[in-house]
């Protein structure tokens, strides 16, 4: 399964689309910055089996997809870029699912890293709560967009390590 290579390219495309989606300059939104507590430790561990590592990445992509699929998101971002971004994420999710099956064998159920997946879920809950508290303001979305870009770039390092392990 050649996921790390293909996913890395997909990740780069997603990052470029996210960058292009920006509506207002972050310079205007400095006061709205927020530390969402990206679960860096979940992407630092070398103890993962490849299938487990992919399942954590899958959760992050899935949560990102969900976040940008809301009606509030549709009202904020330029539709054509949002659609391209969602399509890119969807493609990555499909690739990952196929890769996990290939990695562990069709009959076996992959051992999920429950704690790591929960940490990713909680991270996105904090993001959603922030957006709600800020009433989905343009600056709040800008902060979130920048945060997702940052989390994608951090997970890219994780993927590169995964590729080196192969």
């Amino acid at each position: 399964c050649d996921l790390p290579q293909t996913h890395s390219l997909g990740n780069r495309r997603a990052l470029i689309l996210l960058a292009q989606m920006g509506r207002i300059s972050p310079f205007s939104c400095l006061k709205d910055r927020h530390d969402f507590g990206f679960p860096q430790e979940e992407f630092d561990g070398n103890q993962f089996q490849k299938a487990q590592a992919i399942s954590v990445l899958h959760e992050m992509i899935q949560q990102t997809f969900n976040l940008f699929s809301t009606k509030d998101s549709s009202a904020t971002w330029e539709q054509s870029l949002l659609e391209k971004f969602s399509t890119e994420l969807n493609q990555q999710l499909n690739d990952m699912e196929a890769c996990v099956i290939q990695e562990v064998g069709v009959e076996e159920t992959p051992l999920m890293n429950v704690d790591s997946i929960l940490a990713v879920k909680k991270y996105f809950q904090r993001i959603t709560l922030y957006l709600t508290e800020k009433k989905y303001s343009p600056c709040a979305w800008e902060v979130v967009r920048a945060e997702i870009m940052r989390s994608f770039s951090l997970s890219k390092i994780f993927q590169e390590r995964l590729r080196r392990k192969e």
């Epitope: 960058a19 400095l30 940052r150």
Partner: antibody, heavy 121, light 107 residues
Framework: QVQLVQSGAEVKKPGSSVKVSCKAS????????ISWVRQAPGQGLEWMGG????????NYAQKFQGRVTITADESTSTAYMELSSLRSEDTAVYYC??????????????WGQGTLVTVSS | DIQMTQSPSSLSASVGDRVTITCRAS??????LNWYQQKPGKAPKLLIY???SLQSGVPSRFSGSGSGTDFTLTISSLQPEDFATYYC?????????FGQGTKVEIK
Amino acid sequence: QVQLVQSGAEVKKPGSSVKVSCKASGGTFSSYAISWVRQAPGQGLEWMGGIIPIFGTANYAQKFQGRVTITADESTSTAYMELSSLRSEDTAVYYCARHLEYAFPDKFDYWGQGTLVTVSS
Amino acid sequence: DIQMTQSPSSLSASVGDRVTITCRASQSISSYLNWYQQKPGKAPKLLIYFASSLQSGVPSRFSGSGSGTDFTLTISSLQPEDFATYYCQQSYSTPLTFGQGTKVEIK
């Protein structure tokens, strides 16, 4: 390895304009912010404004609004700062400074070597 | 605009001394404060960000503290290469503003 290389020193007449360039290498040029900071001889540091190339539009300090134009050319990974209606008080070293990639533009992580602009009749 | 005031404007110290520079903001800036070191004829260098986080590659003798309006940069044991001018900078809102600088000279 991140590097910011600025254009050379300039001597300008009062009332004229100056355009300073800053060529960046390392990282994805379009996705990080570049600010311009100036320092008059023997004085402190002063933020003039900044740009994130992917956005195109720049933010300026009120003091320089209308007199400064910050632009970026993604094809050459170069940022520019143009200051018009120059006066003697604009004599300073002008620095470009890069902010971290995929982060809010709040701290200046990398700096150019500086460009001395002298305004004299 | 947020005004940043540093004190003292200059100080004389010896190698091995503990040096403290303070920075006060005209309004609360949370922890959005950075410290820079500048040597003559050189560009500034980031030392501390977000009030107390040490920039990668900066010696551990440098430390920062504070939040709200009052901040401190401490050099625990001054080294010959630390004689320079130090600036604080707020990043709470634009325009990003700097303190007037503190020059650390050899006694």
